[in-house]
Amino acid sequence: MAVTACQGLGFVVSLIGIAGIIAATCMDQWSTQDLYNNPVTAVFNYQGLWRSCVRESSGFTECRGYFTLLGLPAMLQAVRALMIVGIVLGAIGLLVSIFALKCIRIGSMEDSAKANMTLTSGIMFIVSGLCAIAGVSVFANMLVTNFWMSTANMYTGMGGMVQTVQTRYTFGAALFVGWVAGGLTLIGGVMMCIACRGLAPEETNYKAVSYHASGHSVAYKPGGFKASTGFGSNTKNKKIYDGGARTEDEVQSYPSKHDYV
């Protein structure tokens, strides 16, 4: 039960995280004009990974895409790459994790396969989250560097008579969305990896026998746990010490009331 919950929660958290990474990647407000020196600017600038925008006081917003590829800073290209890799890995991870979910049955998929898929998706989510966090952090570092560089050269002009105020940019909303989303994807991935441990069939040194005393029918179940000898065809991770409380995989057609070991 706890394994199913951990896996399910990991999936949901990762799903929210990846949705956030996609949102952050698409958002225009990666960097916004710093208003410290001009808090009431009539023209507000902000930039994303794909285009830059200008919002005028009338409310009109004009956005222009970065139609060049070679002319863009290498760091921006790197951030784009990290975010896209994060999205792709996350999407694949989601696809894999759907099939790995304990509450979803696909044919006669064994728990060991589900465990492997859960681990794979978990690792994918962790890498996806790290890519997003790295991408956002690289961009943030780039902003900080440019901010202080433009502060040092804030006012230029002939003899100080004419001031050319350089537009300084600070952290935009997308950075915070990206950090949070990356963190959620990472947490979701860790949860999936933890759930994998609970799903994995454990090696035991005894053959488990389960008796179902229900008046008329008695069931002899060899291989309750997959024994070290490989005995028994039932490779499902059965808990035979449940005292009657069955997991979803243990629902049987026997009309028994109690399980005894």
């Epitope: 004009q33 009539a42 830059s52 200008v54 005028e56 006081s57 409310g59 009109f60």
Partner: antibody
């Protein structure tokens, strides 16, 4: 066609207040901000502030804060400028203008002006 | 506040002549985000409200005769009237549209000889 109709001339006593109107017609009122300017006789123009009917956002020139108040009556597409504690320095022509939206980012249509004379 | 300085304060020309008036701003009106200059030119005839001639430093407002041309970038701007007509008798103002408070130049009064 776009029109900004301003209220008539005002003769007021020092210390009093005056409220003038600017009625917009011929366009979608909530789309465009309304700007207010002051022009002393034979002098240049001074920006007082603006009001955006879309989100009721109001901005003032620091110089006119406490002196000017902008309000709106959306039902009649009218923006009001109220000037308080009037002195002889407030004697001027006050204009309202529509700020263009989009490519035409400037004050593209102006009212005829409201003349305010402060005299005892 | 951005200070707008216009020169000359007045000039007198004959009809048909070319006129150039200057406007300088204390800060750049060029916005880095869209490489657009936020400067407008207005014409105010006696007893009338100002009329928009040029916005974005060089874009002519619809209905404005093509003899009016705006140019310049950053802090230095120019309004040129290629062939002055009698009806061009007016005061011409430049205006900062980039930062609050919006500020106007002192104006250039154009007189016809």
């Amino acid at each position: 066609q776009v029109q900004l109709q301003q209220s008539g001339a005002e003769l007021v006593k020092p210390g009093a207040s005056v409220k003038m109107s600017c009625k917009a017609s011929g366009y979608t009122f909530t789309t465009y901000p309304i700007e207010w300017m002051k022009q002393n006789h034979g002098k240049s123009l001074e920006w007082i502030g603006n009001f955006h009917p879309y989100n009721d956002d109001t901005k003032y020139n620091e110089k006119f804060k406490g002196k000017a108040t902008l309000t709106v009556e959306k039902s009649s597409s009218t923006v009001y400028l109220e000037l308080s504690r009037l002195t002889s320095d407030d004697s001027a022509v006050y204009y309202c203008a529509r700020r263009g939206y989009g490519s035409s980012y400037a004050m593209d249509y102006w009212g005829q002006g409201t003349s305010v004379t402060v005299s005892s | 506040d951005i200070v707008m300085t216009q020169s000359p304060s007045s000039l007198s020309v004959s009809a048909g002549e070319k006129v150039t008036m200057s406007c300088k701003s204390s800060q750049s009106l060029l916005n880095s985000g869209n490489q657009k200059n936020y400067l407008a030119w207005y014409q105010q005839k006696p007893g009338q409200p100002p009329k928009l001639l040029i916005y974005g430093a060089s874009t002519r407002e619809s209905g404005v005769p093509d003899r009016f041309t705006g140019s310049g970038s950053g802090t230095d701007f120019t309004l040129t009237i290629s062939s002055v007509q009698a009806e061009d008798l007016a005061v011409y103002y430049c205006q900062n549209d980039h930062s609050y408070p919006y500020t106007f130049g002192g104006g250039t009064k154009l007189e016809i000889k």
